[in-house]
């Protein structure tokens, strides 16, 4: 009874479980790769727990390995649009500070229409992700086609 | 050495570590696009820890924050088939209570014959989860290659 | 304030929060299908908390149901190279204790390059969790296409 | 308690090389990144590199690119920064400091510093 | 690279003064700033990280502000100790650069 007392009065901030699941804002203009996201429960099932977003970007806010998932549908697409738009690729990973930039993801679309993918990494305080979608075709905005989330797992 | 203690002597379930993973069990009748799922040990690793099954779909038991997963693989598929029966449709959403009605993740197989991902989103106690096919092809009820689950991850 | 001093003064490992991300080493020879891992900060950003390698698989320490995610990209890889050399396989499953031994995860490739899921399973302290990946195409050693992990997620 | 502790001063010729030696106690010293950062007299600091000394993966400046070699003995808990084919404006004292934060979350907030090693290039 | 510059190049004030210093980068690094203090002959020491977050066991009476390019040190209420030379280094982008240096000397 008293650990459940204890757990009720710290925040829960403080037990880290900062979580976040975006939905597809804008993709960017030309040259620029990235998707941008947005989030918020006025937007629909995104939040925001702790991450926050920095124009359109996730960063972390705490310390720790976290699961990073993702998963992208491409708009107005086919295995024929997809084969014949080759090479069409989706890449997650740090992009700020650029002095800790590194790539934790990648996966390409070949015949698909959709990827989706996830795995544990560590993040620090301050590092922001961003997610490069190459290639020329759109990202569907549906949010159930279309998110991007971490959930951090420990120290 | 309290805190450990505590920690024993408190059922899991008020840590809020409701999970489950489910196994295939059987198709709609035909007009149903539903998946039936079964669960529970004497079935192999599947399992129930607070959600559970109501006329093999999944009920939630406590609020929060939930990794939602699926993979779902054909029967009896190659990608030539795959694509001669496309659109073959797999979508995940709230089918109950009707007024919190919302398609969670949806994902098409274009030439593929496995689709999988997994995402955060926030349930409520009550909320029935429903997983859709939609097209002719039938899905494996092979248990490593189809399966649906969820884990309980923050309030 | 009682019970964030005791979780201060507990080590993590108490707390149960094994978990392990993999890149891949090496695949094994002929008539060998397993793939060989390897974790460690000294390599980037593979890790392993709790569970450890034993000749390239990874080995449970801790009873308890886990997330089990993994994906595998072939190397020199286009659609057309992966349906000529269909089928092209990764299974998942625990391969010893022998009177243990089950498949958990089963994925073809199909006209795609890359395959990626999650499942959550309980596994026992001993476990043995093997990765095989059946056909003639190699796996990329890029550690951003290739990964292999696990995270424990309640008793 | 951590430190780090460097090896003495040097007084070496143009053209030559010296090597730098810094060793850690009071943490284990494979888990923090060690920076390299050199202040010439009456100067500000100027950063010369890193080593991580887990993996002994390593970032020069492009400034010092084809001159420094960083290296470190995990085994003594030591790292060593060699600089070559030394100038009279490499004169400077030569510090090693550690990474606030562990390897995987390093930010390059030096929160340790070794006392610092004197090196004067001289004809 | 990116250039940071530090003003004033040196400052005097007094013992219980309130001391503002600022750093400013060639282009946006986010909080990607420390603040180190050297004394004559020392090594240098960690004060402020992340442009704003206080080094353990560093005084309350030193705070750090800011965010993109602009940010300033805080000292509010001078002590004696506190006469030395001060730094801001980025770590936005490689390679890692330091302010040229404010002075701060007794009046």
């Known amino acids: 009874q008293r650990f459940a007392q204890a757990q009720q009065q710290l925040p829960l901030e403080s037990l880290g479980w900062d979580v976040a699941e975006l939905q597809l804002n804008h993709t960017g203009p030309q040259q620029d790769p990235r998707l941008y996201w947005q989030g918020g429960p006025a937007l629909g099932r995104s939040f925001l727990h702790g991450p926050e977003l920095d124009k359109g970007q996730l960063r972390i806010h705490r310390d720790g390995i976290y699961m990073v998932h993702i998963q992208v549908t491409l708009a107005i697409c086919s295995s024929t649009t997809a084969s014949r738009h080759h090479p069409t690729t989706l890449a997650v990973g740090i992009c700020s500070p650029a002095s800790r930039s590194i790539s934790l993801l990648r996966l390409s679309f070949h015949q698909g229409c959709t990827i989706a993918s996830q795995r544990l990494t560590p993040l620090a305080r301050g590092d922001t992700l961003c997610t490069n979608l190459t290639g020329t075709l759109l990202p569907s905005r549906n949010t159930d086609e279309t998110f991007f989330g971490v959930q951090w797992v420990r120290p | 050495q309290r805190f450990a203690q505590a920690q024993q002597q408190l059922p899991l379930e008020s840590l809020g570590w409701d999970v489950a993973e489910l196994q295939l069990n059987h198709t709609g009748p035909q007009q149903d696009p539903r998946l039936y799922w079964q669960g529970g040990p004497a079935l192999g690793r599947s399992f129930l820890h607070g959600p559970e099954l109501d006329k093999g779909q999944l009920r939630i038991h406590r609020d929060g924050i939930y990794m939602v997963h699926i993979q779902v693989t054909l029967a009896i598929c190659s990608s030539t088939t795959a694509s001669r029966h496309h659109p073959t449709t797999l979508a995940v959403g709230i089918c109950s209570p009707a007024s919190r009605s919302i398609s969670l993740l949806r994902l098409s197989f274009h030439q593929g014959c496995t689709i999988a991902s997994q995402r955060l989103t926030p349930l409520a106690r009550g909320d029935t989860l429903c997983t859709n096919l939609t097209g002719t092809l039938l899905p494996s009820r092979n248990t490593d290659e189809t399966f649906f689950g969820v884990q309980w991850v923050r309030p | 304030q009682r019970f964030a001093q005791a979780q201060q003064q507990l080590p993590l490992e108490s707390l149960g929060w094994d978990v392990a991300e993999l890149q891949l080493n090496h695949t094994g020879p002929q008539q060998d299908p397993r793939l060989y891992w390897q974790g460690g900060p000294a390599l980037g950003r593979s890790f392993l908390h709790g569970p450890e390698l034993d000749k390239g698989q990874l080995r449970i320490h801790r009873d308890g149901i886990y997330m089990v995610h993994i994906q595998v990209t072939l190397a020199i890889c286009s659609s057309t190279t992966a349906s000529r050399h269909h089928p092209t396989t990764l299974a998942v499953g625990i391969c010893s204790p022998a009177s243990r031994s089950i498949s958990l995860l089963r994925l073809s490739f199909h006209q795609g390059c890359t395959i990626a899921s999650q499942r959550l399973t309980p596994l026992a302290r001993g476990d043995t969790l093997c990765t095989n990946l059946t056909g003639t195409l190699l796996p990329s050693r890029n550690t951003d296409e290739t990964f292999f992990g696990v995270q424990w997620v309640r008793p | 308690q951590v430190q780090l502790v460097q090896s003495g001063a040097e007084v070496t010729k143009p053209g030559a090389s010296v090597k730098v030696s810094c060793k850690a106690s009071g943490y284990t010293f494979t888990s923090h990144y060690i920076y390299w950062v050199r202040q010439a007299p009456g100067q500000g600091l100027e950063w010369m590199g890193w080593?991580?000394?887990?993996?002994?993966?390593?970032n020069y400046a492009q400034k010092f690119q084809d001159r420094v070699t960083m290296a470190r003995d995990t085994s003594i808990s030591t790292a060593y920064m060699e600089l070559s084919r030394l100038r009279s404006d490499d004169t400077a004292v030569y510090y090693c400091?550690?990474?606030?934060?562990?390897?995987?979350?390093?930010?390059?907030?030096?929160?340790?510093w070794g006392q610092g090693t004197t090196v004067t290039v001289s004809a | 690279d990116i250039q940071m510059t530090q003003s004033p190049s040196s400052l005097s004030a007094s013992v219980g003064d309130r001391v503002i210093l600022t750093c400013q980068a060639s282009?946006?690094?986010?909080?990607?700033l420390h603040w180190y203090q050297q004394k004559p002959g020392k090594a240098p020491k960690l004060l402020i990280y992340?442009?704003?977050d206080l080094e353990t066991g560093v005084p309350s009476r030193f705070s750090g502000s800011g965010s993109g390019a602009d940010f300033t040190f805080t000292i509010s209420n001078l002590q004696p100790e506190d006469f030395a030379t001060y730094y801001c280094q980025q770590y936005d982008h490689l390679p890692i650069t330091f302010g040229q240096g404010t002075r701060l000397e007794i009046k």
């Open positions: 282009q946006d690094i986010s909080n990607y």
């Open positions: 992340d442009a704003s």
């Open positions: 400091a550690k990474d606030r934060k562990r390897e995987y979350y390093y930010n390059f907030g030096m929160d340790v």
């Open positions: 080593i991580n000394p887990n993996s002994g993966g390593t």
